[in-house]
């Protein structure tokens, strides 16, 4: 079955750059199958833009301006990339790449989509570092005391643009965790936002990790922000007991972040 | 030219109980095009979910049931038993691949169906309230509480900001809430919430030790602080963004 | 009925300690959050303490912080106001009064008549 | 802290006439505002919570308004039993309840 990924989930760019979108094909050759290019504009319906065929035609909406948009396919990538060309506020939304899956009987084809590029258009001087910054929470001796069950937060602060993934994962496993989130809230000129996971007592001995998905993350790569395992005997220590200098001191991991 | 027009732009629906979309076809026969359905979700995922003559999307073919009203000119998809998963936007789709035609393997798309998942209605469930804390930094965590309307209050009396609180569906099918904060003391900072005629607080769920009064305005009588945990870590914790890290004891 | 009835209320000199009470009747007392306020004699209304049903959470303003201490019994129907380091400011009518949550909006529904507390020397 | 400012201080008015009396805050507590009625040697009386809701028990000619930083109590017609002062109170930051100084409305 063909799967599509849109490795940048936003592209940031000011008045009359050039925006490139990319759309990595797999599980099917992308000499073989056409990939198509749609957008969607706040408030708009979903609108077809342009395609490129097995055989490299390329295919414009009618109404679309020509030299405003431009796609091809690299096959040694297996690679599809939209090209905006003197991007516009109206170039503002968000661009899907899609493909019919392949499938032998053609009247059971289905088309499927990546999961999208947002375009930003900005006018604003950015600080250098506009990555998310994350701080952890751990569970609280309550929660694991009195409900077998731990949630760890993760917060992610100081980023822009507001285009963000967020998803957790045991240190040794690549599947995805059931987990909860905030909105995205605005912040001055950057956003904020929160996720959490609640996690059984029998998972707590494990490390959790807090994948992060931004355009700005530092080389291009999810951040991955760890949460160390709990230790039950911990958890299930007399209150009274002293695990610190203080009883009343508090165990703070902080994570704080400096910009070059 | 050919348009697709949802029924309508938001519907509810509550966990378990079928709900119907539907959308029309105007200028055209919707016999002459192939409909699909897709729905996107937080984080723009569109996921394909049906296409005429029976094509489902991989795990939507037991909860989903697409249709075509051929005298009315729409097309019908019933979720048959909605849960918390199934919130997002919905869109119908058409095409004619495979009917013959010029640049026919394109879709025209309807505007969106935003479908809201709501609890079904149950018995009132009061909340369970925990604090989180690292530096300056607080999270009131409110789980399993049933109806949504709720009011979280973190009492401090030195505030830095405060965010508005996330209310989300819990696994289970009730709420749960977050909320978060900045304070200058944050190592006094309780949480208390206003749900269902009544206050439930942090300190209700507190491990219980002989307590003494705080001499700090608005503070809980427990000495013990929820996330005051003893929790050591077995790893680093470590992450591509943050260059410095400080254990704080 | 809901009744609230302050008593202790007096002459103390500054510096000196006074035990305020509420005694409560016409509704199960252990299921209230009572507050105490104040109001200086000619002045507006001033939030002074809270403490929840079961006493988990007490909470005070900042011009009594160290000084008051809040407490109840609810075998005995009974709120308290420990009040120690008396100042002049402190002289006020003192009111308990209840707590309601409507829905999720804290009201003071229920009031006493307040009792006067005098500090001079 | 929020602060709380009435005005005017004082409303000299006759039975009949309409009372507008105005409440700010110096920063947005949405509609997390309360109005209360006191007479001489009484306890305070809630009349309105949530900006606009009536207590129970209170009368239609008493009515609230506003959201974020300007709320309004109006009585529609003074009664006899109206002379009296009306403080806001502010619950944003719960538990600490915020009072206005208040405002005498006096018969004329």
């Known amino acids: 079955a063909g799967h599509l990924e849109q490795p940048q989930i936003s592209s940031t760019k000011t008045l009359s750059k050039t925006a490139r979108l990319e759309c990595v094909v797999s599980g099917i050759t992308i000499s073989a199958t056409s990939v198509y290019w749609y957008r969607e504009r706040p408030g708009e319906v979903i609108q077809f833009l342009v395609s490129i065929s097995y055989d490299g035609t390329v295919r414009k909406e009618s109404g679309i301006p020509s030299g405003k948009f431009e796609v091809d396919r690299i096959p040694e990538t297996s690679t599809s990339t939209l090209t905006i060309h003197n991007v516009e506020k109206q170039d503002i939304a968000t661009y899907y790449c899609a493909l019919w899956e392949a499938q032998q009987e053609l009247g059971k084809k289905i088309k499927v989509f990546g999961p999208g590029t947002k375009l930003i258009i900005t006018d604003k001087q950015l600080d250098a570092d506009v990555s998310p910054k994350p701080t952890i929470f751990l569970p609280s001796i309550a929660e694991t005391k009195l409900q077998k069950a731990g949630t760890y937060l993760c917060l992610l602060e100081k980023f822009f643009p507001d285009v963000i993934k967020i998803h957790w994962q045991e240190k040794k496993s690549n599947t995805i965790l059931g987990s909860q989130e905030g909105n995205t809230m605005k912040t001055n000129d950057t956003y904020m936002k929160f996720s959490w996971l609640t996690v059984p007592e029998k998972s707590l001995d494990k490390e959790h990790r807090c994948i992060v998905r931004h355009e700005n993350n530092k080389n291009g790569v999810d951040q991955e922000i760890i949460f160390p395992p709990i230790k039950t005997d911990v958890i299930t220590m007399d209150p009274k007991d002293n695990c610190s200098k203080d009883a009343n001191d508090t165990l703070l991991l902080q994570l704080t972040n400096t910009s070059a | 030219a050919i348009e697709l027009v949802p029924e309508h732009q938001t519907v509810p629906v509550s966990i378990g109980v079928p709900a119907t979309l539907r959308c029309s076809m105007k200028g055209e026969a919707i016999g002459n095009y192939y409909i699909n359905w897709y729905r996107k979700t937080q984080g723009n995922t569109m996921t394909f979910i049906y296409r005429e003559k029976d094509i489902y999307g991989p795990g939507f073919k037991d909860n989903f049931q697409g249709d075509i009203d051929i005298a009315k000119n729409l097309a019908v998809l019933k979720i048959l038993a909605p849960s918390e998963r199934d919130e997002g936007s919905y869109y119908c789709a058409c095409d004619t691949l495979g009917m013959g035609g010029e640049y026919t393997d394109k879709l025209i798309f309807g505007k969106g169906t935003r479908v809201t998942v709501e609890p079904r209605s149950q018995p009132h469930t009061k909340p369970s309230v925990f604090v989180m804390k690292n530096g300056t930094n607080v999270a009131c965590l409110v789980k399993e509480f049933y109806p949504k309307d709720i009011r979280i209050n973190l009492v401090s009396s030195k505030k830095i900001t405060e965010f508005d609180p996330a209310i989300v569906i819990s696994p289970s099918g009730k709420y749960n809430a977050v909320k978060l904060g900045k304070y200058e003391d944050s190592n006094s900072v309780t949480c208390s919430v206003q749900h269902d005629n009544k206050t439930v607080h942090s300190t209700d769920f507190e491990v219980k030790t002989d307590s003494t009064d705080h001499v700090k305005p608005k503070e809980t009588e427990n000495t013990k602080q929820p996330s005051k945990s003893c929790h050591k870590p077995k790893a680093i914790v470590h992450t591509e963004k943050v260059n410095m890290m400080s254990l704080t004891v | 009925e809901v009744q609230l009835v302050e008593s202790g209320g007096t002459l103390v000199q500054p510096g000196g300690s006074l035990r305020l009470s509420c005694a409560v009747s016409g509704f199960t007392f252990s299921s209230y959050d009572m507050n105490w306020v104040r109001q200086a004699p000619g002045k507006g209304l001033e939030w002074v303490s809270y403490?929840?049903?079961?006493?988990?959470?007490?909470y005070y303003a900042d011009s009594v912080k160290g000084r008051f201490t809040i407490s109840r019994d609810n075998a005995k129907n009974s709120l308290y106001l420990q009040m120690n380091s008396l100042w002049d400011e402190d002289t006020a009518v003192y009111y308990c009064?209840?707590?309601?949550?409507?829905?999720?909006?804290?009201?003071?529904?229920?009031w006493g008549q307040g009792t006067t507390v005098t500090v001079s020397s | 802290e929020i602060v709380m400012t009435q005005s005017p201080a004082t409303l000299s008015l006759s039975p009949g006439e309409r009372a507008i009396l105005s409440c700010r805050a110096s920063?947005?507590?949405?509609?997390?505002l309360a109005w209360y009625q006191q007479k001489p040697g009484q306890a305070p009386r809630l009349l309105i919570y949530?900006?606009?809701n009536r207590a129970t028990g209170i009368p239609a000619r008493i009515s609230g308004s506003g959201s974020g930083t300007d709320f309004t109590l109006t009585i529609s017609s003074l009664e006899p039993e109206d002379f009296a002062v009306y403080y806001c109170?502010?619950?944003?930051?719960?538990?600490?309840?915020?009072f206005g100084p208040g405002t005498k409305v006096e018969i004329k």
């Open positions: 009064a209840r707590e309601d949550i409507v829905v999720v909006t804290p009201i003071l529904q229920h």
């Open positions: 920063q947005s507590v949405s509609k997390d």
């Open positions: 949530d900006a606009s």
């Open positions: 109170q502010q619950r944003i930051n719960w538990p600490l309840f915020t």
């Open positions: 403490i929840s049903s079961s006493s988990t959470a007490k």
